[in-house]
């Protein structure tokens, strides 16, 4: 099950966030979320994973694009984009289920 | 010490949208560390999860009430919401705000009674 | 959908006694995710274990936790009278989120 958490082997990763503790961190996967706030310019962080893997899952939307990945360091270089704006008439569905 | 304090209306009619929303304090929402939900507990009752989001905004929903559920974040404001439309009296509940982290459900708000009735 | 099962629905012992609580999940579950809470009439849950068997910051001794696969419990080694209350076990970190229905742990 892709789902489940996992505690198993763990991997550094780049962090690039308000919160990171230091350039790396460990954890079970390697993540680069790009979120665009209301009025804002978009912001990507990078970091590391241990819950919740369904996240990687969701489709990008004109407000957030979430990466994973499994390896050393592998989020170093990833850049991600937003979908462009959708039509007023749609609804953007951050709700991966 | 992170704390959470859910806020609301205590009464709600049927039909109409509950609405909640969760302070925090002591921590920042923003961190990727953590998941923010909200749970409810009927009247003696066990609980039931509601649905979660991660700072991005992205959110989760139990599926049993996804068609109705919305959860919101406003990280300049430090807080999350819930809202609930369609209410009925099965709705009445004590509802919850909760941090999930690595160490499981570690803060919860200490909830809020809300009823559904005209 | 995981169902997690927690027996017996109601446990009667006297203080001093040890309690031993059941949960089992319809299909086998991370044990790294699996959590127990107390509750007392009129308060929020209160973490007492996560990782099957890591106590909560300020979690006294006396609880434990141990399990894997699809059998958890929860071990209370000697009852204090503050310990009678509701404890749930509960799947975390992946979707669905699921809690047991709890066992009722009651005097004797």
């Known amino acids: 099950d892709p789902v489940k958490p996992s505690r198993g082997p763990l991997v550094t990763c780049t962090c690039e966030s308000p919160h990171c503790k230091g350039p790396t961190c460990r954890g079970a996967w390697c993540t680069v979320v790009l979120v665009r706030e209301e009025g804002r310019h978009p912001q990507e962080h990078r970091g590391c994973g241990n819950l919740h893997r369904e996240l990687c899952r969701g489709r990008p939307t004109e407000f957030v694009n979430h990466y994973c990945c499994d390896s050393h360091l592998c989020n170093h270089n990833v850049s991600l984009v937003l979908e462009a704006t959708q039509p007023p008439s749609e609804q953007p569905g951050t709700d991966g289920q | 010490q992170v704390q959470l304090q859910e806020s609301g209306p205590g009464l709600v009619k049927p039909s109409q949208t509950l609405s909640l929303t969760c302070t925090v304090s002591?921590?920042?929402?923003?961190?990727?560390?953590?998941?923010w939900n909200w749970i409810r507990q009927h009247p003696g009752k066990g609980l039931e999860w509601i649905g979660y989001i991660y700072y991005s905004g992205s959110t989760y929903y139990n599926p049993s009430l996804k068609s109705r559920v919305t959860i919101s974040v406003d990280t300049s404001k430090n807080q999350f919401s819930l809202k609930l439309s369609s209410v009925t009296a099965a709705d009445t509940a004590v509802y919850y705000c909760a941090r999930e982290s690595v160490a499981g459900f570690d803060y919860w708000g200490q909830g809020t009674l809300v009823t559904v009735s005209s | 959908e995981i169902v997690l099962t927690q027996s017996p629905g109601t446990l009667s012992l006297s203080p001093g006694e040890r309690a031993t609580l059941s949960c089992r999940a319809s299909?086998?579950?991370?044990?790294?995710?699996l959590a127990w809470y107390q509750q007392k009439p009129g308060q929020a849950p209160r973490l007492l274990i996560y990782g099957t068997s890591s106590r909560a910051t300020g979690i006294p001794d006396r609880f434990s936790g141990s399990g894997s696969g699809t059998d958890f419990t929860l071990t209370i080694s000697r009852l204090e009278p503050e310990d009678f209350a509701v404890y749930y076990c509960q799947i975390y970190g992946s979707i669905p989120i699921t809690f047991g229905q709890g066992t009722r742990l009651e005097i004797k």
């Open positions: 002591g921590g920042s929402i923003s961190s990727g560390e953590y998941y």
């Open positions: 299909q086998s579950v991370s044990s790294s995710y």
